[in-house]
Interface confidence: low
Amino acid sequence: DGCKDIFMKNEILSASQPFAFNCTFPPITSGEVSVTWYKNSSKIPVSKIIQSRIHQDETWILFLPMEWGDSGVYQCVIKGRDSCHRIHVNLTVFEKHWCDTSIGGLPNLSDEYKQILHLGKDDSLTCHLHFPKSCVLGPIKWYKDCNEIKGERFTVLETRLLVSNVSAEDRGNYACQAILTHSGKQYEVLNGITVSITERAGYGGSVPKIIYPKNHSIEVQLGTTLIVDCNVTDTKDNTNLRCWRVNNTLVDDYYDESKRIREGVETHVSFREHNLYTVNITFLEVKMEDYGLPFMCHAGVSTAYIILQLPAPDFRAY
């Protein structure tokens, strides 16, 4: 069928709760493309009817909720004017009774389920909740060893649990819980997180360093394609997220409809003392509205921006 196959990492998921996966693979999904989801090489696409338990929501596949029998390989087919890519995602569903067993015993869990706090520092845990815009998430509650977390040292801030003056006793099994509302129905999302404690502060107290950009402007012609890398160095055990934002919104969300400006796939190089991360931003076509706007690269608490500006007129051309 002429589609190029791309194999994504396995996702290990908990049954009886909502789950969503977004079919994005920049720069493939940056242009005018159609996205269709299939299960286990079926010729019949996943339903787009929002009342269906499993359905496609724009570029997402949404499970409301996920069930044990949903394990399998899902494909999303991205068709552009001159291209076709088939992305394979292996979803493994397990019956998880969070209070009974340790999530640490599970194989190959992603880093979202394993987080690190730094001893004696003010640090944070992140509740990773990835859902389409049709899903409304309520306030997040945090639990440790099945008890709701309370106390002066803990503060809930959006999707993060801020922990001040981390102690050795803060290691253990955490969970973040949120109520998700979709089409008038409510579902509980509960993510288990295994937390370990490290004494390693890393460079400069584990504050990521943005090497590029450096809060500067870039001259670029109207209508051109532009790719800018954000290069970040951070300690190997960091839990910082790296992303591009504009107007304090993720670029992928801000340009969700046009997909004209997209964030790339993060890569990293491992060094003895740290990792060097690269995540790019792609402007498929620079428009007038992009000039003068700060495009921010975020890495943990660090930020740096680029501002696009029109090149100065070249009077030698006259």
Partner: antibody
Amino acid sequence: EVQLVESGGGLVKPGGSLRLSCAASGFDFTDYYMHWVRQAPGKGLEWVALIRNKAAGYTIYYSAPVKGRFTISRDDSKSTLYLQMNSLKTEDTAVYYCVRDMTIYDGYYVDYALDYWGQGTLVTVSS
Amino acid sequence: DIVMTQSPSSVSASVGDRVTITCRASRNINIWLSWYQQKPGKAPKLFIYKASNLHTGVPSRFSGSGSGTDFTLTISSLQPEDFATYYCLQSQSYPLTFGQGTKLEIK
């Protein structure tokens, strides 16, 4: 001029203890990672321990043969590196070198190597 | 632990000869390899870092190359003061590990 001067070596019985010191001068000691490397008579070089700088949280690493017996420490105010050696064994007999790590961290510019070495101090563990 | 294997363990050569010493890592160490020269009764001296960078004051007849698992130290034209033992060191990960050394002797 960078100088590293070790002291504290000598003859000790198996099971005994010894504390090595290394006085650093000619550079800003606070900024650098510091190592101990040893060399048994007629043998090759063996890395022993590392202590990172303050900016990196004074993190410590040891080689397997000395872990639990040796303790590396530093006093930045005195520009001095230490190695406390307990439960010494005959196989710990060696010249112990105090070494500066040239690790320079500024974005892309990272170099890992041991750029300056002291003259060494001999530790003999024998009954 | 990463094992560093140097070869040969000893080499006899004459003044003016070109000599190559190799160092092989048991797994990928990128370019995090340095070379040291040690003379009897003296402390080692850094000669090459990051696989190919000459340390300050090291003569240009010394050169280093390689990345990943295979590295070489080359002396283009041996001088009398070059007769010594040479060690490689990986600093990609802890514990840091040295090669067993290559003794360069006068033929």
